[in-house]
Every structure is written in C-alpha cells, then in structure tokens.
C-alpha cells in the first residue's frame, strides 16, 4: 500500500559543475525498517521485468555490495526516517531525475527528486522593495537557490563596483522545505544613489568570482537645487539690483512647481527659476532660497544671505543697569542698525562729546554721582555716519552726602533748655525719606529732620543724626556742650582726720563732682548765717559753740546747688559744772536733800565723783546724790567731778545747811 510511504524533501535542487549537492530528505515506512535502497539516475520502469532501469548511482543491499560511484554519492540516511543524500562533486550530466528506490520487507517505493546542474555557477537574484525613497532605510535581498555543506560560498554587495561598507547578514537554509543562501543588506539610499548599479556577487570560499546579479537603483527624491546669485558675494548697496537663479540638479520624479522664500516666508508672484530684485532696500536683506516640488515633496536650495549695505540708522543707548548705585560698574551699549557693522562710535554725555570713547560699549568701572545724565551716541560705517538718537538716562543713586547735625539754639545751651537740632545734607538720590538720631531718647520730632529735646539734661553730651534714603549716612556727632549748675555738692572734713575735740584746728572742704562752666563761687552757712566764700571753711581753734549744721552752696553762671546739711560735732571735757540742791541749800534735818551735778559735756559725762568739804570722796557715783534722812552733820560744802572720754571737770563748792527740827530744839 503505497500510501504508507511518506517523503519530505525539496522538489528540485540546483547546482553547477564541480559543486556539490546536499539533498535533505525524510521518510516514513510504516510497515518496518528499510531493507534495500537504490539511487537511480533517470529511472524508467520496465513493465516486462517489473523493475526499474537506469544508472545506479548508489546501492545498498543485504550483501553489502557498493558500486565504485558510491564514493561520490553518499546515503546519509537510516533505516526508518532519514533519507538525506550528498553528491560531491556534482557533474553536469547529473542533471535530471534522481530516483530513490526503497524496499522494506513487504513494500516498495520509488521517490523522484529533480536535480538541475548547470555548466557554470548560476547568478543569484536581487530582490528590491517596490519603492525606494531617499533617506528611508530599505533591505536589499540577494537570494541564491544553492547551499551545500561541502562547497562553501559567499555573497558580496557592490555599489558601482565598489564593495558596500554596510554590514550584510548572510543566512543559509538546508531543510526539507528549502535549500538556499541569502544575504540581506540594510541601506539608507541618498538621492545621489539614484540610477546607480548595485551588484550581488557570488564568490567561492577563496573569494573567486562565480556569478552575479545587478540592478539599477530607482531612488525617489525631492528636487535637488543649486542657487546662483549675481553679484556672487550677495553684498549690495541700497538701490542696486540682484539676480538669483535656481537650477535643478536632480529630481525623481520630475518637478512640478517653483517658488522663492525669504527668511522662510514665501515670496508672492515669484514662480520662475529666476528672481530679479531691482533697486533693493535694506529691508530686503535676509536669507533667500528657492523651493521646487515634485510628488515626493518640496526641495530647498541652500540659503543665500543677501546683505544690503546702508549707513547707520539713528542710534539708541542701552544702559546696564539704571538706576546704578554709586561705586558699582555700568556698561553703555550703542545700538544702531547698520551694514556693514559700525567701525567707529562717538559718545556724548549730556550733549558733550566723551573723549577717547570710540567703541560700541563704554564701561565705567566705578560710577560716581556726576556720571548721572543723558548718554547718546553716533555710529559710523564705510557708508556714512548715523544720527544721534534720543539717548538714555543714567540715574546714579547714592547715600545722602555731607550730612551735618546743626544746633538751632542760641549758645550756650543750659540744662533744662529745649534744644532744637536739624539734620542737614547736601544732596541725596533717591530723596531722603527718614532720619535717625543717636543716642536714642524719648524726644520729639516735630517735623522731618528736626529733633526737639525738651528739658535737656546736663549729661546730654553729643548728638548725631543720619539722613536715610535706601542707605543711611551719619553726620559727625555735634557736642551740645550743655552748661549746668554744680553737681553733687557735699561737705567733707579734711582735718582733723579723727573726731573733733575742742581746741582742734578744723578744715571743711566744699566738694562737687562737676560744673560747666568750671568757674564757681562758694558760700558757707550755718543755719542761714553766712560764714565764708572760699572752698574751705577753717577753724583755728574749734569751740563747742561752733558745733551745728553746716552747708556749702556752690554756684556758677548757670545755677546754684546746696549740699546736704553736715553736722559738726565738737567733743569736749565736762565744763560749767555746778551742784544744784533740791529742795534748796537749807534743809531741815530728817527731810530729804538731793544734790545734782549739772554739766555741759560732749560726749555726756559717763562717771561722777562727789567730794565733801574735806575733799574727801564720797561713795556716790551717779549724777544725783540723795541724802535721806538728812542730818545736821551733813551740813557743809560739797563739789562734784564729771568725767567723759575727753577729760574731767570739777564744780565749785556749794554749801548745804541742815538745821535742827523744832522737835530737836524742843528737846534741848
């Protein structure tokens, strides 16, 4: 049952004389393994013998006999699925039909394969895409229906006979479906490749030429243009004429329209290959090109830069930057449309020419207030001198200048006066908006830049003001030179250094801390009695009567200041002692008599001693001597002595008379 045999292989294989052929082949004999295989060349079935006749190229039998041809022809298959064959070398007369006679135990089959062997290597075939456009990548394919393991080949690409530098990818196929060698080349054709010959060359392993295929490239592209201008440098003066010509060097397909563009914008009613510009003006300066279109798209020529030369136009000045801060740098730029560019500039400041300034830019490294004003310039080129434009204003800003603090009061200023000061300045830009004063005080500012100090203090020494715009400028401090009465007047004892004893020499000093003006007068007073007009008050020999409250008063032309009362204390021994008797110096016996030792002393008497008429001291030491009851024998003269830290004093004698009571007289 023939349907049981299934074969797969290429229908026809191609080769050339001396090459080889490799025949990929698979089969399936379903009833068992292959027992016999014969490869026929052009087999024919003999009905008489019921066998195939023809040249046997290969035979595999059970007895193992193989014809000599078998070295050239090899069966590379097996007994159940592979039927691959190789013929090496292959000859021209191998062309025709190859017959594979297969026999298994019960079945037979003849499978036919066509072999086409040419005398010389046949050419490969170049395949191109249906349309090629410039700059669009395409793949060129070179296909050869040949591949054999025993005969290596290579495919090379050439453009106009020169190997192409793009890398090609070569692939081979030796399968039951197809046998081929293919080379693919990725390529971005330019318009200049149009009409060029591309060759795919077949070479052997040594690079020897075997065959080739050629094609002519048809590269679709936009028109390629050349622009020509008269005059050739495209530099003209106003009023001259200019001619531009557009030439098409290549177009595929043919061009359809022509137009001209200036600075990218289409010029109306200019649809020929020649553009005539008569009596040009400076406005016609610019970049010109022609544009020609075909079905692919528009093509543009290179741009021609038409320069219409003219004398400088009225100039303008640009300032970097205004307003400028004093001390900063400023740059002035003279801007004037001109062609060719100006070669010389003249600069003006407030209408007066600035000497030595001939450049487009003027740089002032350190701006000063006098640099302010209007700056203008004039530009000059080979065609003439431009006009001076309106100019630009430079505003120079600076802190207030020459700031002074001015005292408005008549001099001198006295403590307690109301002082008015003004803050003056010479110039300022921008205007002064506020003022500051040092030191700070709870002072009035009745108007801008005026300070009023009510009841000025003696210690208000200096005042400074600042005038402020964006910056503050301080004036030198001004001395108020406030005049005031003597201050901190006090009495100071300068001698003796210790406590004052009666009879001492005493000096009191009138001190004060400060006075302005310095010339002063002194007054010494004790309880409203004037004592002297010197800075010192002197006592040659102080007496207790000099004790009391002393003050000194110091005055200058501004005022007068008194000291606190200073108490002068004089220490002296007890004096003016006397014995007083109570109830009197005559007392009746039996009554009470009190003797008191009266004295004047500083410090007070600390110790008393009593004496009788015999100068005998009595055992009593207090100020009072109390006799109770008093006896007639107590009659006599008594005296006392007082003692303090300074010394002793004694009283004169005082006589006490004690008389008998009526009772005593009665008894006698």
């Amino acid at each position: 049952d023939s349907s049981k045999w299934v074969f797969e292989h290429p229908e026809t294989l191609y080769a050339w004389e001396g090459a080889c052929v490799w025949i990929p082949c698979t089969y399936r004999a379903l009833d068992g393994d292959l027992e016999s295989f014969i490869l026929f060349h052009n087999p024919e079935y003999n009905k008489n013998t019921s066998k195939f006749d023809g040249t046997r190229l290969y035979e595999s039998t059970k007895d193992g006999k193989v014809p000599s041809e078998q070295k050239r022809v090899q069966f590379l298959g097996d007994k159940n699925k592979n039927c691959t064959l190789s013929i090496h070398p292959v000859h021209l007369n191998d062309s025709g039909q190859l017959g594979l006679r297969m026999e298994s135990k019960t079945e037979k089959w003849m499978e036919r394969i066509h072999l086409n062997v040419s005398e010389r290597p046949f050419p490969p075939h170049i395949q191109l895409p249906p349309e090629i456009q410039e700059s669009q990548e395409v793949t060129l394919t070179c296909l050869l229906n040949f591949s054999c393991y025993g005969y290596p080949i290579q495919l090379q690409w050439l453009l106009e006979g020169v190997p192409m530098r793009q890398a090609a990818v070569t692939s081979t196929s030796l399968t039951i479906k197809s046998v081929f060698t293919r080379s693919e080349l990725k390529f971005s054709p330019q318009w200049s490749h149009h009409g060029k010959i591309v060759t795919c060359q077949l070479q052997d392993a040594d690079g020897k030429f075997l065959s080739n295929d050629t094609v002519q490239l048809n590269v679709k592209h936009t028109p390629k243009l050349e622009i020509k201008v008269t005059p050739s440098d495209a530099i003209v003066r106003e009023g001259d004429s200019v001619t531009m010509t557009c030439e098409v060097s290549s177009s595929n397909p043919e061009y359809t329209t022509v137009s001209w563009l200036k600075d990218g914008t289409s010029l109306k009613k200019q649809n020929t290959f020649t553009l005539n510009l008569r009596e040009v003006t400076k406005d016609q300066s610019g970049k010109y090109c022609c544009q020609v279109s075909n079905d692919v798209g528009p093509g543009r020529s290179e741009e021609v830069f038409l320069q219409v030369q003219y004398a400088p136009e009225p100039s303008t000045v640009q300032i970097l930057h205004s307003p400028a801060v004093e001390g900063s740098q400023v740059e002035f730029l003279c801007m004037s449309l001109a062609n060719p560019l100006p070669t010389n500039y003249t600069w003006y400041h407030n209408g007066k020419e600035m000497q030595g300034r001939t450049e487009e830019k003027v740089h002032i490294p350190k701006i000063l207030p006098w640099h302010a004003g209007t700056y203008s310039c004039v530009a000059e080129n080979i065609l003439g001198t431009g006009q001076r434009g309106p100019g630009a204003e430079l505003d120079v800003q600076y802190p207030p200048k020459k700031v002074t603090t001015v005292i408005q009061n008549p001099m001198p200023i006295r403590e307690g006066d109301t002082v008015t000061l003004s803050c003056n300045y010479n110039s300022s830009n921008p205007s002064v908006t506020r003022y500051e004063w040092k030191p700070h005080g709870a002072w009035e500012e009745p108007s801008l830049g005026v300070l009023k100090i009510q009841n000025v203090g003696w210690d208000n020494t200096t005042i400074a003001c600042a005038a402020c715009n964006s910056w503050c400028s301080w004036a030198s401090p001004v001395a108020l030179n406030v005049q005031y009465a003597p201050r901190d007047v006090r009495v100071r004892k300068i001698k003796p250094l210790s406590e004052i004893h009666s009879g001492n020499s005493v000096s009191l000093q009138c001190d004060f801390s400060s006075s302005h003006p310095k010339e002063v007068q002194f007054f010494w007073e004790k309880n409203g009695r004037l004592l002297g007009k010197e800075s010192q008050l002197n006592f040659d020999s102080i007496s207790p009567e000099d004790a009391g409250s002393y003050s000194c008063w110091v005055n200058n032309s501004i005022g007068q200041t008194a000291s606190k009362a200073w108490t002068l204390e004089v220490l002296y021994a007890p004096r003016r002692l006397r014995v007083s008797m109570s109830p009197g110096d005559q007392v009746m016996e039996g009554k009470s008599a009190t003797l008191t030792c009266e004295s004047d002393a500083n410090p007070p008497v600390s110790h008393y001693t009593w004496f009788d008429w015999n100068n005998q001291s009595l055992p009593y030491h207090s100020q009072k001597l109390r006799l109770e009851p008093v006896k007639v024998q107590h009659s006599g003269a008594y005296w006392c002595q007082g003692t303090n830290s300074v010394g002793k004093g004694r009283s004169p004698l005082s006589t006490l008379t004690v008389y008998y009571s009526p009772e005593t007289i009665g008894r006698r």
Epitope: G416, W458, S557, G559, Q560, T561, A562
Partner: nanobody, 114 residues
Framework: EVQLVDSGGGLVQAGGSLRVSCEAS????????MGWYRQRPGKERERVAV???????IYADSVKGRFTISRDNAKNTVYLQMNSLEPEDTAVYYC????????WGQGTQVTVSS
C-alpha cells in the same frame, strides 16, 4: 532791690497740711538755690529744705517724707508743702539763699495745735 516776702502761715491742727510761699526779687531767681528755714521757740534757726536751681531737693531728716519743696521760676516763687504736721513743727518759717546775704524776709508763723 533785694526782697523776700514769706506768706501762707497759720494755725493748723496736728496731722493737717499747710503750704507756705516765698516770692523773691532782686536776684536772678532761676539761677539761685532756695532754702526754707525755721526758728522754733527757744531754739536756734535750722534748715528744713532746699531746692537747687536744677530743681533737685534736699530735706532735713525730721521732715523727710512729710514736707515737699518746689519752685516756679516764672513766678520767682518757692513753696513748702507741709503735710502730717506735728506740734514740734510750730515755728516761724523763712526762705533764704546766700545770694540774699544777711537779708531775711519777715517770716511766716506756723502753729500746730495738738
């Protein structure tokens, strides 16, 4: 002509208040320090308070916190405001300044009854 005119004295109960005044002429008043003095019965004259030309003040310890001395330069007048008066404050009160030399005003009697 140098002149001092004292006024405002009177009789007041203990704890009461009184203000005495002294108008001065014949000196530059605003530049003079002025003092109030008093003479108590049987006692030496004593200084009670002083107002300096800059209006700073000085008080005797015995009157501190009770008496206030002040001046009005526009009126050439010095004042003594006496509060919390005590019988010991009974005296003739005078105003004076060294600029007046030995000249004293007539004084003004202040009597504090208990």
């Amino acid at each position: 002509e140098v002149q001092l005119v004292d006024s405002g004295g009177g009789l007041v109960q203990a704890g009461g208040s009184l203000r005495v005044s002294c108008e001065a002429s014949g000196i530059t008043f605003s530049r003079a320090a002025m003092g109030w003095y008093r003479q108590r019965p049987g006692k030496e004259r004593e200084r009670v308070a002083v107002v300096n030309s800059d209006s700073s003040t000085i008080y005797a310890d015995s009157v501190k916190g009770r008496f206030t001395i002040s001046r009005d330069n526009a009126k050439n007048t010095v004042y003594l405001q006496m509060n919390s008066l005590e019988p010991e404050d009974t005296a003739v009160y005078y105003c004076w300044s060294p600029g007046f030399g030995s000249y004293w005003g007539q004084g003004t009697q202040v009597t504090v009854s208990s």
